[in-house]
């Protein structure tokens, strides 16, 4: 079933997703798409990647991370209600049905009237269990900054714990870095 | 005008070896997905495999996966299927088809086909 | 898998009357990976309707498509002598692409 994220209307959402790159710069084809991942590539492409670059996007769509270290989590800007839906990250990795998908639940929610409140959770919190997802190879221990050690295994949405769009910003701006073997 | 134009069909025996080939021509043959399809006597539509217009990614229905191989040479403008331990079941006409779902476009469907070639299998 | 299943098997009318066809996929399909095909004998497929409703390039728009979920259905609103063929639903939302097994429709 999908993870999902939260965010609110007039705000950016973000939807994370990760791989590393097996050498510097040799970068793997990702495709983002509105829509549930289907048998192949993304449907509704808002944005893709190559093995170089960005080569396709459309307005409101964006990467904030550093792809080319793998980061290819997804920026939306300034939601309105119609940008709810499931979106499909697809990590096109050559060979045989190797590619990775992943589907990300998108909620958005009314604006607030009152005051935005203080966060409310620390990060210990926020992670009560190790973070485990399939993988094809060995599992890797990575220290995420000064945030409390989380296994991960291969290839990661980073947050199938994750809940929301505010808390998966804070990840992101603590200089949060996933490793893949 | 856009076309595929299938060949190498043939009789094998069980247990032997065939290779199919596809000519694309009228589009830009490396921005596409394409698949194989076959059609057993008298029966329906079977996907088979499809390929990646750069060739790096691959999938196979369970029936053929270990036996059949899909590749392509873009240089060429070609699509091919290498069929091994071919199965009495395998006796179908097999097409090719571009599958329509092009960079930066939103369109699943398989919009341009050959006419076929037939692939019987038999002692 | 997911299995899709056609009704009627065979659907015989007239020209001039209207067809409805009928896909039913055994798990949710997204309408933008359904697509129906016309078949006639010795002959490919030709692709109709894609995305679950566009007509594909040079479909009259005698033929539509429509439904969501798990129910799809492809209507032909007056039937053409040529329209007598088999007609094949598709999808593409999960691996392995999967057609249905076909409907006959035949000149009654």
């Known amino acids: 079933s999908e993870v999902e994220y939260r965010a609110e209307v007039g705000q950016n959402a973000y939807l994370p997703c990760f791989y590393t790159p097996a050498a510097p710069g040799n970068l793997v084809p990702v495709c983002w798409g509105k829509g549930a991942c289907p048998v192949f590539e993304c449907g509704n492409v808002v944005l893709r990647t190559d093995e170089r670059d960005v080569n396709y996007w459309t307005s409101r769509y964006w990467l904030n991370g550093d792809f080319r270290k793998g980061d290819v989590s997804l920026t939306i800007e300034n939601v309105t209600l119609a940008d709810s839906g499931i979106y499909c990250c697809r990590i096109q990795i050559p060979g045989i049905m190797n590619d990775e998908k992943f589907n990300l639940k998108l909620v958005i929610k009314p604006a607030k009237v009152t005051p935005a409140p203080t966060r409310q959770r620390d990060f210990t919190a926020a992670f009560p269990r190790m973070l485990t997802t399939r993988g094809h190879g060995p599992a890797e221990t990575q220290t995420l900054g000064s945030l409390p050690d989380i296994n991960l295994t291969q290839i990661s949405t980073l947050a199938n714990e994750l809940r929301d769009s505010r808390l998966a910003n804070d990840l992101r701006d603590s200089g949060a870095t996933i490793r893949i073997g | 005008q856009v076309q595929l134009v299938e060949s190498g069909g043939g009789l094998v025996k069980p247990g032997g070896s065939l290779r199919l080939s596809c000519a694309a021509s009228g589009f830009t043959f490396s921005d596409y997905y394409m698949s194989w399809i076959r059609q057993a006597p008298g029966k329906g539509l079977e996907w088979v495999s499809f390929?990646?217009?750069?060739?790096?990614?691959?999938y196979y229905a369970d029936s053929v996966k270990g036996r059949f191989t899909i590749s392509r040479d873009n240089a060429k403008n070609s699509l091919y299927l290498q069929m091994n331990s071919l199965r009495a079941e395998d006796t179908a006409v097999y097409y090719c088809?571009?599958?329509?779902?092009?960079?930066?476009?939103?369109?699943?469907?398989?919009?341009?086909w050959g006419q076929g070639t037939t692939v019987t299998v038999s002692s | 898998e997911i299995v899709l299943t056609q009704s009627p098997g065979t659907l015989s009318l007239s020209p001039g009357e209207r067809a409805t066809l009928s896909c039913r996929a055994s798990?949710?399909?997204?309408?933008?990976?359904l697509a129906w095909y016309q078949q006639k004998p010795g002959q490919a497929p030709r692709l109709l309707i894609y995305g679950a409703s566009s007509r594909a390039t040079g479909i009259p728009d005698r033929f539509s498509g429509s439904g969501s979920g798990t129910d799809f259905t492809l209507t032909i609103s007056r039937l053409e002598p040529e329209d007598f063929a088999v007609y094949y639903c598709q999808q593409y939302g999960s691996s392995p692409i999967t057609f249905g097994q076909g409907t006959r429709l035949e000149i009654k």
């Open positions: 798990q949710s399909v997204s309408s933008s990976y």
């Open positions: 390929i990646s217009g750069s060739g790096s990614i691959i």
């Open positions: 088809a571009r599958d329509g779902m092009v960079r930066g476009m939103n369109f699943y469907g398989m919009d341009v």
